[in-house]
Amino acid sequence: LIIGFGISGRHSITVTTVASAGNIGEDGILSCTFEPDIKLSDIVIQWLKEGVIGLVHEFKEGKDELSEQDEMFRGRTAVFADQVIVGNASLRLKNVQLTDAGTYKCYIITSKGKGNANLEYKTGAFSMPEVNVDYNASSETLRCEAPRWFPQPTVVWASQVDQGANFSEVSNTSFELNSENVTMKVVSVLYNVTINNTYSCMIENDIAKATGDIKVTESEIKRRSHLQLLNSKAS
């Protein structure tokens, strides 16, 4: 969480951003909030990116003002107009690119004053893993698959019964480049599994951490998946 205050001139207003991550090829949100102001016509929202000459986005006098927008963001940005009233200046970024990573500034002007805060935006690929029993294998085997990751993650297996056990000797992980030549499909196989145990396949890079759990008993199979973005620090 980054909290910024305005400087000089009019009063300063508090602006708050949250560091976040974007999943390439999907839409992302750059979070920014400010002290709401009743005079809507005076609210100006500017999004800037370090190293980029033009603006990322500008919202002024109740509408988007995109004459100064940088080419790399053309047609890809929007603020949520109905949320501006409650002090939400978050930016929607369509079709996130790897090159969108960097330091952004959310700069706000209201009738009460000015303020800004920076935000670190990471980009990559992350997806939920699915763990299944591999019935084609000769021994009891689990197969963990996740369709899109970047940068290349680490994969670690764990089990509820054998806590702290190292499964690297009885697992095999491969990374297969997807057709767009950036993201990769993650496949990890765990051999010699026992029934009545819960196994977890944990995939992690510097952007996200995902876990796929599977519990195999003689009568049923239970699955659960969870994905968590890392470094969501507010500013």
Epitope: E35, I38, D42, D82
Partner: antibody, heavy 116, light 107 residues
Framework: QVQLVQSGAEVKKPGSSMRVSCKAS????????ISWVRQAPGQGLEWMGG????????NYAQKFQGRVTITADKSTSTAYMELSSLRSEDTAVYYC?????????WGQGTLVTVSS | EIVMTQSPASLSVSPGERATLSCRAS??????LAWYQQKPGQAPRLLIY???TRATGIPARVSGGGSGTEFTLTISSLQSEDFAVYCC?????????FGPGTKLEIK
């Protein structure tokens, strides 16, 4: 001087619709949101919804969704609130107010009585 | 939606004394809170916004405080015109919601 002038009191039958108007100064209309807040006899304030002509947005409280329509006529700087399928519980004073997020000027209120 | 509660429901105070009214939100509203005064047969009047900023024309004896979920409105040295109903309102999220009000009465 900021003024919000509302239409007069009304008596309505259950099942009918009501429409209250709120005339504001041109500056208020072009720079601020206009919200509608009601107050049933002896009760607290209840936000129904609001419109921000400058943003082209309108928001409604879930409770009134589908039954309330808030519109704005920029040419006359007038906001309207229409509530349909009236029932006795809709008997209240209806206020228009300048804002959100908070409300710094209020209309004089319009008493709407729903009775058969 | 965010539910606003106020305490006490009514408060009897003598003129010249201090009154402290409380408002609580069911989840954090940061400082996005306003206070209103309402007298019988009249529209509400904005006293405080941003939890602690006095609206135009509001005397210094009226003050607001708090952030997150707990807020107070303090009126020092009560005068006859201060006896009314006071309610709080959050504007952190849609829908905007009001507290039920505290009736401030003359003791």
């Amino acid at each position: 001087q900021v003024q919000l002038v509302q239409s007069g009191a009304e008596v309505k039958k259950p099942g009918s619709s009501m429409r209250v108007s709120c005339k504001a100064s041109e500056d208020t209309f072009s720079s601020y949101a206009i919200s509608w807040v009601r107050q049933a006899p002896g009760q607290g304030l209840e936000w129904m919804g609001g419109t921000a002509p400058i943003f082209g947005t309108t928001n409604y409280a879930q409770k009134f969704q589908g039954r309330v329509t808030i519109t704005a006529d920029k040419s006359t700087s007038t906001a309207y609130m229409e509530l349909s399928s009236l029932r006795s519980e809709d008997t209240a004073v209806y206020y228009c107010a300048r804002g959100g997020p908070y409300f710094d000027y209020w209309g004089q209120g319009t008493l709407v009585t729903v009775s058969s | 939606e965010i539910v606003m509660t106020q305490s006490p429901a009514s408060l009897s105070v003598s003129p010249g004394e201090r009154a402290t009214l409380s408002c609580r939100a069911s989840q954090s509203v940061s400082s996005n809170l306003a206070w209103y005064q309402q007298k019988p047969g009249q529209a509400p009047r904005l006293l405080i916004y941003g939890a602690s900023t006095r609206a135009t024309g509001i005397p210094a004896r009226v003050s607001g405080g708090g952030s997150g979920t707990e807020f107070t409105l303090t009126i020092s040295s009560l005068q006859s015109e201060d006896f009314a109903v006071y309610c709080c309102q959050q504007y952190k999220n849609w829908p905007f919601t009001f507290g039920p009000g505290t009736k401030l009465e003359i003791k």
